[in-house]
Interface confidence: medium
């Protein structure tokens, strides 16, 4: 069956200066290939953090994606500015050249309140 | 406080056709997401559709995929179902249900409408 | 698809005495899990949101365990007005959103 990326949260609040985890879980890890998160959609949309040796400033893996049968991508992102709010979303890929996009969990928007 | 008036409900005929509406009031109805689930008659609850605040995000059942459609006219706090090539075992009360803002649980639930299709 | 299994599907049992409802998830919906109580004539009413959370306005009779695969809903001493039929949900997968297929608690 398909892999599925699964975003059980539809919103999360923040107050700015705190931090807040942004989960999402595969319910496989096949086909091969990376995990990234991106805010927004289509050609705009901004790489957040990629389960790679790539280093995210304020933005980091709440799970170890390096143990071979963990599906838990959340990420965690310190530190929130009012420039952080945005739809997230945790996107499959399937590895080649170059890597395709296989699929996409539903979105989590994120609300970032004043302190 | 929280209301959701389901109506539209009636006896039709296999094939034919129907329009629920479900009118909301005591909340920001723009802000959430809505729902229509059914019951049929001595059945346990099913989910029919989903439809965001904005309007831009759709779900349909695999049941009722392609012949209902799901619509909401936030100036007018209100949500429809049209129902379309209806068929017996669409048969049940029909309730409109308020999403919570965070999950997609209900919060809160309108009392129904019945569709009965007989012929 | 997620499939729940509500068990049982009838609990006959007296004013005061405990109920136990079982909630069973085909695959791990860690705590994504809501209850609900339905009467005749009535809307369906939320009980239960996050496998234990009580919903506002709920009497504290009612509670909730689990995560993952199980779950339970427990009406400690059961009042007239709790003989009902009870249903869980899951929302941790994107819809479609299931339910259980219910569990009657009726009066003995």
């Known amino acids: 069956t398909e892999v599925k990326v699964i975003q059980p949260e539809k919103s999360v609040s923040v107050a700015a200066g705190d931090s807040t985890v942004l989960n999402c879980t595969l319910t496989s890890l096949l086909p091969v290939g990376p995990i990234r998160w991106y805010r927004g959609v289509g050609q705009s949309r901004q790489l957040i953090y990629s389960f790679t040796t790539e280093h995210f400033p304020r933005v980091t893996n709440v799970s170890d994606a390096t143990k071979r049968s963990n599906l838990d991508f959340s990420i965690r992102i310190s530190n929130v500015t009012p420039e952080d709010a945005g739809t997230y979303y945790c996107v499959k890929f399937q590895r080649g050249s170059p890597d395709t996009e296989i699929q996409s969990g539903g979105g989590t928007e994120v609300y970032v309140l004043a302190k | 406080d929280v209301q959701l008036v389901e109506s539209g409900g009636g006896v039709v005929r296999p094939g034919e056709s129907l329009r629920l509406s479900c009118a909301a009031s005591?909340?920001?109805?723009?802000?959430?997401?809505m729902n229509w689930v059914r019951q049929a008659p001595g059945e346990g609850l099913e989910w029919v559709s989903l439809?965001?605040?904005?309007?831009?995000?759709?779900y349909y059942a695999d049941s009722v995929k392609g012949r209902f459609t799901i619509s909401r006219d936030n100036s007018k706090n209100t949500l429809y179902l049209q129902m379309n090539s209806l068929r017996a075992e669409d048969t049940a009360v029909y309730y409109c249900?308020?999403?919570?803002?965070?999950?997609?649980?209900?919060?809160?639930w309108g009392l129904g409408t019945l569709v009965t299709v007989s012929s | 698809e997620t499939v729940l299994t509500q068990s049982p599907g009838t609990l006959t049992l007296s004013p005061g005495e405990r109920a136990t409802l079982t909630c069973r998830a085909s695959?791990?919906?860690?705590?994504?899990l809501a209850w609900y109580q339905e009467k005749p004539g009535q809307a369906p009413r939320l009980l239960i949101y996050?496998?234990?959370s009580r919903a506002t306005g709920i009497p504290d009779r009612f509670s909730g365990s689990g995560s993952g695969t199980e779950f339970t809903l427990t009406i400690s001493s059961l009042q007239s007005e709790d003989f009902a039929v009870y249903y869980c949900?899951?929302?941790?997968?994107?819809?479609?959103?299931?339910f259980g297929g219910g569990t009657k608690v009726e009066i003995k």
């Open positions: 949900q899951q929302y941790y997968d994107r819809p479609p959103l299931t």
């Open positions: 439809i965001s605040g904005s309007g831009e995000i759709i």
């Open positions: 249900a308020k999403e919570n803002n965070r999950y997609r649980f209900f919060d809160d």
């Open positions: 695959q791990s919906v860690y705590t994504y």
């Open positions: 996050g496998a234990s």
């Open positions: 005591g909340f920001t109805f723009s802000s959430y997401d």
